[in-house]
Amino acid sequence: GSGIFQLRLQEFVNQRGMLANGQSCEPGCRTFFRICLKHFQATFSEGPCTFGNVSTPVLGTNSFVVRDKNSGSGRNPLQLPFNFTWPGTFSLNIQAWHTPGDDLRPETSPGNSLISQIIIQGSLAVGKIWRTDEQNDTLTRLSYSYRVICSDNYYGESCSRLCKKRDDHFGHYECQPDGSLSCLPGWTGKYCDQPICLSGCHEQNGYCSKPDECICRPGWQGRLCNECIPHNGCRHGTCSIPWQCACDEGWGGLFCDQDLNYCTHHSPCKNGSTCSNSGPKGYTCTCLPGYTGEHCELGLSKCASNPCRNGGSCKDQENSYHCLCPPGYYGQHCEHSTLTCADSPCFNGGSCRERNQGSSYACECPPNFTGSNCEKKVDRCTSNPCANGGQCQNRGPSRTCRCRPGFTGTHCELHISDCARSPCAHGGTCHDLENGPVCTCPAGFSGRRCEVRITHDACASGPCFNGATCYTGLSPNNFVCNCPYGFVGSRCEFPVGLPPSFPWVA
């Protein structure tokens, strides 16, 4: 039920041992009580006890005090449970009876006689405080008290609110005196079924199934699920949303695995060759004369430059070469002739001109022929005129360069520039790199395209020493010092020859 009407009998007095009909009990009035509780009636009528009824065993003879008893037969206070919303009003009928029969179950005995009865009508709020009363008639007096309390798990002023404390999947709470839920520590929500996650756990990216937990949703990581997971395979990059890969400065490629400053970081070019951060591998080596190979690691044959003139044959020696001259020539490079025009030394229709009073000669060659004796057909590709890996092709009297993608010009010397689209804002300088344009921003601007106006100019404080030029970086607080010759260090503070004790980027 939702509540209990409790009636505590305290004392009954029937000094003369009389019945209601005026007769006396022999040997005394062996007294038990019948209680009927019903809805409020202005005039009490017979009929069903709508709120409940109860009977007691024999509690005493004539006059007696009723002791409290919590269990078994003769329990006091008497309990009248109900399972409806307590209306706040009631009618109560208490009858005292004499029985000649069984002490424990006098209700069933024949020959019971009424001693007296009282009727109470009124209002009664739910509460723990007992209301005490005393009723007299000409022969008897009854002292008693009564109250209405809610059953376990029922609360409120009419015992209509059910609340049963629980700590399981459906809720984690105790009950307040008014029946409202009081969540156990670590739980929240209308029914205390939502865990309170670890403090700081990201609202969107994290969740929990029990208190002080933070489980990350896909794409997020970290104790508080506030760090995105970059794209699988991302090498030198970060993310601001999951599965992104935004390259760190100096790195390129989809997975930021291409070193855009390969020359600086790896020094791949050998034998004094020049390295540039371009080309399909991220760098290109330009060799000094006498060297070849991707990294200029191969020394060319000393004869590769064809030093022997006039058809002389070249033989490599350990650190030099030797020219074997044909008949009629001498000298280190077979450059001197013993022939004269009389010997018809000019080939391929060349014209002979005498020199030094006829002791030597010079050949004037027709187009497409060269050499001291016009003995060589002109190969316009021997001088490697095509830059940037262009292919040289002889076309009759002329030659053309066939350029690699990304280059143009007669000698493939022009880079088809991503800078042509002028991507750098605010007067930034554009540099073409293999993986796209990079902007060097003027003071006061930053960002990948110099689009961010810097309110605080990192260069304003003059952080660079020894006359170095200061550039602001991609973020407003960054700066880069461009050192003059003879100085190194992140602020150009070290003269060359006094290396810093920490790594730096020039």
Partner: nanobody, 120 residues
Framework: EVQLVESGGGLVQPGGSLRLSCAAS????????IGWFRQAPGKEPEGISC????????YYADSVKGRFTTSRDNAKNTVYLQMNSLKPEDTAVYYC?????????????TGQGTQVTVSS
Amino acid sequence: EVQLVESGGGLVQPGGSLRLSCAASGFTFDDYAIGWFRQAPGKEPEGISCISSSGGITYYADSVKGRFTTSRDNAKNTVYLQMNSLKPEDTAVYYCATPGIAACRGIHYTGQGTQVTVSS
């Protein structure tokens, strides 16, 4: 909303050819570099090619150099991957991606991928 949709995958014999297409929408196509990467089961993804916004700069992974060619048609908002002399080790899901900038520097958006299987 940025969308990249790959097509053209399928089953091909070793030595054969395929042409993959990547149709882009939701952004100014000729402002962004576009690239291709692939992922075989149980392996890390591998960037195989990328073409800058202007089309002037293209790079290729060593594993596909000389066999694969990337091109873009800015009028059609489409990038192509021509794959020749295919080998069984080219079997993977091929994805189209963009860094969201003009240069080939990272990945911001990717497509759903198209399966390429090279098998006899």
